[in-house]
């Protein structure tokens, strides 16, 4: 691999680092406009295609929707193939994603709505272990606007263990967000959507390259955390957000100083939700092990605003509302590393449902 990248923009400077977090408490349970969908049918199957997303959007007065589940603001219309076989996809045309990649019509897709009362407490889910996430300013990291999200490419050496013998290395992180007045997390909790969500994507050490792992159970693992508003600025996130202006145009890429990636995640790595799903964008490959932290990461209102207004996507449209609608569980159980269900008994339930990556 060639060394010594010189980006298209100026050389940024380094900020300081810290993280603020909060628990998913009663303050994040569904508000009126974020009502959860009706209960699943008796056979345990979820309703097809979409959950309450269409009702939620309608109640918020967002009228320019091209599909039931996704706003059109962010990516313009889908699928105006420009010749040359581009794999065009957009958040305004998610019903067409299976045409881009058949896996997007799979039965075990992400994101999902995490219904606390339906989670299964699983004592075998141990605290995650992160190693080497506290990066030094040098070497610098590539920060890019790929038209769908802001992406930070991570260097080799960031190791994560889901459990004994389940080791992964971090590849990249990216964010999902809404607008100034509409939240944009991908996962939801009891139907509640958070302002934004971070994903840190990992490749199993059992595979040397990404293409080998795509679609294989446990081949990829994603750590996800919700971003929530608080009065104080998050200095760790400021090291990313302060550079968004420099990559405002689609296709922009710059180099920024290395930072403490663990500071972008909650401090409590022991309380989380776990399920097997997919990539949330095409090709929507399944077999992805999802870990969604219970603790939220706090950003200031100004920082969340900066995230939602700084980037531009295709056809001179703002890069906003870049989240996929929640997908049916289709019989999947979401496990929790702690008793998340409000009425959970002292004894763990569904212990036998616990799975390990690769099972």
């Amino acid at each position: 691999q060639p060394q010594g990248l010189s980006g298209m923009q100026g050389e940024p400077s380094l900020g300081d680092s810290s993280s603020g977090e909060d628990e998913l408490g009663v303050d994040v349970l569904p508000s009126e406009e974020d009502a959860p969908e009706e209960a699943d049918p008796p056979d345990g199957e979820d309703p097809p295609e979409v959950n309450s997303e269409d009702r939620m959007e309608e109640s918020l007065g967002l009228e320019d929707l091209s599909t039931p589940e996704a706003p059109e603001h962010s990516q313009g219309s889908h699928g105006d193939e420009k010749g040359g076989g581009h794999s065009h996809w957009s958040y305004g045309g998610t019903l067409l994603w299976p045409q881009v990649s058949p896996a997007c019509a799979g039965r075990f897709q992400s994101p999902v709505d995490i219904r606390l009362e339906r989670t299964a407490f699983c004592r075998t889910l141990q605290p995650l272990e992160l190693l080497g996430y506290e990066l030094q300013p040098l070497p610098e990291l590539s920060l890019s606007n790929n038209g769908h999200t802001v992406q930070l490419t991570l260097p080799p050496g960031l190791k994560m263990a889901l459990g004994p013998g389940q080791e992964y290395r971090a590849l990249q992180l990216h964010l999902h967000w809404g607008t100034s007045d509409h939240p944009g997390s991908e996962h939801t909790v009891n139907g509640h959507r958070f302002p934004a969500e971070i994903h840190v994507v990992h490749l199993s050490t059992a595979f040397s390259e990404l293409h080998e792992a795509l679609g294989r159970p446990g081949g990829l693992a994603v750590l996800a955390a919700f971003l929530q508003e608080s009065p104080e600025e998050n200095s760790a996130y400021e090291q990313l957000l302060s550079h968004l202006e420099e990559i405002s145009e689609e296709g922009s890429k710059i180099e920024i100083p290395g930072l403490d990636v663990s500071a972008l995640l909650p401090s409590d790595l022991s309380r989380y939700y776990r399920y097997e799903g997919s990539l949330t964008t095409p090709p929507c490959s399944q077999g992805v092990i999802w870990t969604v932290f219970n603790e939220t990461v706090k950003l200031s209102a100004k920082q969340l605003h900066t995230l939602s207004v700084s980037l531009w996507g295709p056809r001179d449209s703002r890069l906003q509302l870049n989240f996929r609608a929640t997908q049916p569980l289709n019989g999947r159980t979401i496990e929790a590393s702690f008793p998340a269900a409000e009425d959970s008994s002292p004894e763990p339930v569904h212990v036998n449902s616990c799975f390990t990556a690769g099972d």
């Epitope: 065009h88 992406q151 490419t153 990249q172 490749l203 293409h211 679609g215 689609e250 296709g251 490959s285």
Partner: nanobody, 117 residues
């Protein structure tokens, strides 16, 4: 194994043109359709410079030094990335590398472009 193979480099006079190609092969899943594709270059004794990017939507971005002279394009049906280079200058002399960025970076081995009279 996934491979990116550049071709089309060579010796050209100032003001001339070249078309570089980058063919992706070996991947069991066509991840390159979902990758942002880029051309980088490295001149002798210099660092790596990002020349042009094309996203999955076809959006393009160029470095100031090549804007208006170079054109990046892609053909996902052929798993191929292109760089049309016109009005070449001596300072465009470099090894040109192809890059695919989808969750992880894939790099080619590079092709030499020499602009000299």
């Amino acid at each position: 194994e996934v491979q990116l193979l550049e071709s089309g480099g060579g010796l050209v006079q100032p003001g001339g043109s070249l078309r570089l190609s980058c063919a992706a092969s070996g991947n069991s899943v066509n991840i390159f359709s979902f990758a942002a594709m880029s051309w980088y270059r490295q001149a002798p004794g210099k660092g790596l410079e990002l020349v042009a990017v094309i996203t999955t939507t076809g959006g393009t971005k160029y470095s100031d030094s090549v804007k208006g002279r170079f054109t990046i394009s892609r053909d996902n049906s052929k798993n191929t990335l292109y760089l049309q280079m016109n009005s070449l200058r001596a300072e465009d002399t470099a090894v040109y590398y192809c890059n695919a960025d989808y969750l992880q970076d894939y790099w080619g081995q590079g092709t030499q472009v020499t602009v000299s009279s």
